[in-house]
Interface confidence: low
């Protein structure tokens, strides 16, 4: 058993049929010595008396809020949550496996630049009685500070018969050094509580590996005289790290016909313009990637050829 | 020559070669998400790798103030990785083809380090860790880890030289 926060405790249980469970001793936080009784949740049934209560925690029916009273007055509470371990593996019932970039990916994180700011998100089908708490640090053995906000519900989607809820959190490294070569990964830890079930999820990454620039901005076409060619120009996204002479991007320019089956013409360039042939009913798209480190491409910015 | 301690680095040459290094480092080990190398216990390789740290003056402000602090660290790293790529980790089984990206990477690391090295002057560089994996699979894993680390190192070096070429060239 360990304390998650004040008056909230997590009991770690090996979860299998007829498991012996865990013996837990609760102590009433009071100077009083006698006349103390214990109850669980809303029930008025007295579970025991005395300053301590010893219980055997085996299942969710044994978890909940234990309260000690004296003469009708509440003295203190202890909320017990369960953390299940099945076949040596901690349960992951609350969050959905996103399976990208690999199986057992519950948390996904992205950064728009090297400022030390990043966003993580996760998915669940649970709609109520759900709380999340997020902590993060640079490195684990000698952690350096990363400050995370509160996790918020950021999207709701219908997937078949199910509703899916996306939660996200923004974090900022306290002393970020955008130009340095990271040697210690960022660690993100999410505590998830659904009713009386506790689970924790972790992710470890370098900012450089989760970089995904915003799409290029101000995408414009300029027809070239007496030619089917156009000059496409664009700018670095506002959110990208500066100066651009240091934090450089590379770009992919694509000409795509109306039909997905039509051949795509692609040009790669480090410049912020390119000359391409504009076909009727086609569209021109541009996306960006860090020039020197192959992290994710941005989403496409597009304009029609007409 | 882009000389640590010298006053006029050959920024454009260094930029071109460092960008080539980035391309080679990724073609030598393109896998990004398929193998989480950090899970394999990195201690023996990464502890001694000369990372480009916050205090090395490789940020735009530090380069403007004076690029020599940064050039030293880059030079030190290039020599370090050049030695690693020439070691038993890469020359042992499973053997690499003579024209593999790793061979080109090794040659380019040497080329850039020589651009940064004043003739007849040999800077002290830290020793490479004594790593001699006994099994081919261990060697393979170590190669991946070293190449992943090198990708990060050369990315910073390439940014430095690109910025230098754009803003610090005479």
């Amino acid at each position: 058993i360990w304390e998650l926060k004040k008056d909230v405790y997590v009991v770690e249980l090996d979860w299998y049929p007829d498991a012996p469970g865990e013996m837990v001793v609760l102590t009433c936080d009071t100077p009083e010595e006698d006349g103390i009784t214990w109850t669980l949740d809303q029930s008025s049934e007295v579970l025991g008396s005395g300053k301590t209560l010893t219980i055997q925690v085996k299942e969710f029916g044994d978890a909940g809020q234990y309260t000690c009273h004296k003469g009708g007055e509440v003295l203190s509470h202890s909320l017990l949550l369960l953390h299940k371990k099945e076949d040596g593996i901690w349960s992951t019932d609350i969050l959905k496996d996103q399976k990208e970039p690999k199986n057992k990916t519950f948390l996904r994180c992205e950064a728009k630049n090297y400022s030390g700011r990043f966003t993580c998100w996760w998915l669940t089908t649970i709609s109520t009685d759900l709380t999340f708490s997020v902590k993060s640090s640079r490195g684990s053995s000698d952690p350096q500070g990363v400050t995370c906000g509160a996790a918020t519900l950021s999207a709701e989607r219908v997937r078949g018969d199910n509703k899916e809820y996306e939660y996200s959190v923004e974090c900022q490294e306290d002393s970020a050094c955008p130009a340095a070569e990271e040697s210690l990964p960022i660690e993100v830890m999410v505590d998830a509580v659904h009713k009386l079930k506790y689970e924790n999820y972790t992710s470890s990454f370098f900012i450089r590996d989760i970089i995904k620039p915003d799409p290029p901005k101000n995408l414009q076409l300029k027809p070239l005289k007496n030619s089917r060619q156009v000059e496409v120009s664009w700018e670095y996204p506002d959110t990208w790290s500066t100066p651009h002479s240091y934090f450089s991007l590379t770009f992919c320019v694509q000409v795509q016909g109306k039909s997905k089956r039509e051949k795509k013409d692609r040009v790669f360039t480090d410049k912020t313009s390119a000359t391409v042939i504009c076909r009727k009913n086609a569209s021109i798209s541009v996306r960006a990637q860090d020039r020197y480190y192959s992290s994710s491409w941005s989403e496409w910015a597009s304009v029609p050829c007409s | 020559r882009a000389v640590p301690g010298g006053s006029s680095p050959a920024w454009t040459q260094c930029q071109q070669l460092s960008q080539k290094l980035c391309t080679l480092a990724w073609s030598a080990h393109p896998l990004v998400g398929h193998m989480d190398l950090r899970e394999e216990g990195d201690e023996e390789t990464t502890n001694d790798v000369p990372h480009i740290q916050c205090g090395d003056g490789c940020d735009p402000q530090g380069l403007r103030d004076n690029s020599q602090f940064c050039l030293q660290r880059i030079h030190q790293g290039l020599i370090f990785y050049e030695k690693l790529l020439g070691s038993d980790i890469f020359t042992g089984e499973p053997s690499l083809l003579p024209d593999s990206p790793v061979a080109q990477l090794h040659a380019s690391l040497l080329g850039l380090s020589q651009l940064l090295q004043p003739e007849g002057h040999h800077w002290e560089t830290q020793q490479i860790p004594s790593l001699s994996p006994s099994q081919p699979w261990q060697r393979l894993l170590l190669r991946f880890k070293i190449l992943r680390s090198l990708q990060a190192f050369v990315a910073v070096a390439a940014r430095v030289f690109a910025h230098g070429a754009a803003t610090l060239s005479p």
Partner: antibody
């Protein structure tokens, strides 16, 4: 043998000027930075500033900016620390030291500057 | 007032082990900057003892070792000898204009 040899002890009056030197030998002087460090009687080390002899680029600690001038002449492998108007509080031992991969790996023997009326 | 804080003095008997701490902040040691240690024997110039947190220049006995954790660093001396009696200073880079900062120094007495 790599060494830095500093000029001899100086006794000066307040308001006088002074230039002390630090000559490097046994290595390529231009390829290493030279830093200056002050140690007041019975006190600790204080970093004053640093110079790259190859291009005479200097950087000063804010505490010493405007109080001293650091210069170098790479043709004679010598760095200098100078005051235009000494104060009694400038009484101290002044060390020059070489910087490269290893910070301040070689030190001069020190120059004792005494300022007294 | 030094930017890096060291204990003014430490002492130990011959053969013993002593450690000297050096505490900085998020703008110097905590920013990932290396820590270096210098030894100053009485009446002599300082000498580089440890650089880059834990590396020893050639000629420095392996009785001297350095480590760094978070915003602080420490120097350990094992098998204390009478000739180790000296002042010891830590130094680091720092954010802002100062560039180099020293600790206030620690006087080591061998009893």
């Amino acid at each position: 043998e790599v060494q830095l040899v500093q000029s001899g002890a100086e006794v000066k009056k307040p308001g006088e000027s002074l230039k002390i030197s630090c000559k490097g030998s046994g290595y390529s002087f231009s390829n290493y930075w030279i830093g200056w460090v002050r140690q007041m009687p019975g006190k600790g080390l204080e970093w004053m500033g640093i110079i790259d002899p190859s291009n005479s680029y200097t950087r000063y600690s804010p505490s010493f900016q405007g109080q001293v001038t650091i210069s170098a002449d790479k043709s004679i492998s010598t760095a200098y620390l100078q005051w235009s108007s000494l104060k009694a509080s400038d009484t101290a031992m002044y060390y020059c030291a070489r910087w490269y991969y290893k910070p301040f790996d070689v030190w001069g023997q020190g120059t004792l500057v005494t300022v007294s009326s | 007032q030094s930017v890096l804080t060291q204990p003014p003095s430490v002492s130990g008997a011959p053969g013993q082990r002593v450690t000297i701490s050096c505490t900085g902040s998020s703008s110097n040691i905590g920013s990932g900057y290396d820590v270096h240690w210098y030894q100053q024997l009485p009446g002599t110039a300082p000498k580089l003892l440890i650089y880059g947190n834990s590396k020893r220049p050639s000629g420095v006995p392996d009785r001297f070792s350095g480590s760094k954790s978070g915003t602080s660093a420490s120097l350990a001396i094992t098998g204390l000898q009478s000739e180790d009696e000296a002042d010891y200073y830590c130094a680091s880079w720092t954010d802002g204009l100062s560039l180099v900062v020293f600790g206030g120094g620690t006087k080591l007495t061998v009893l």
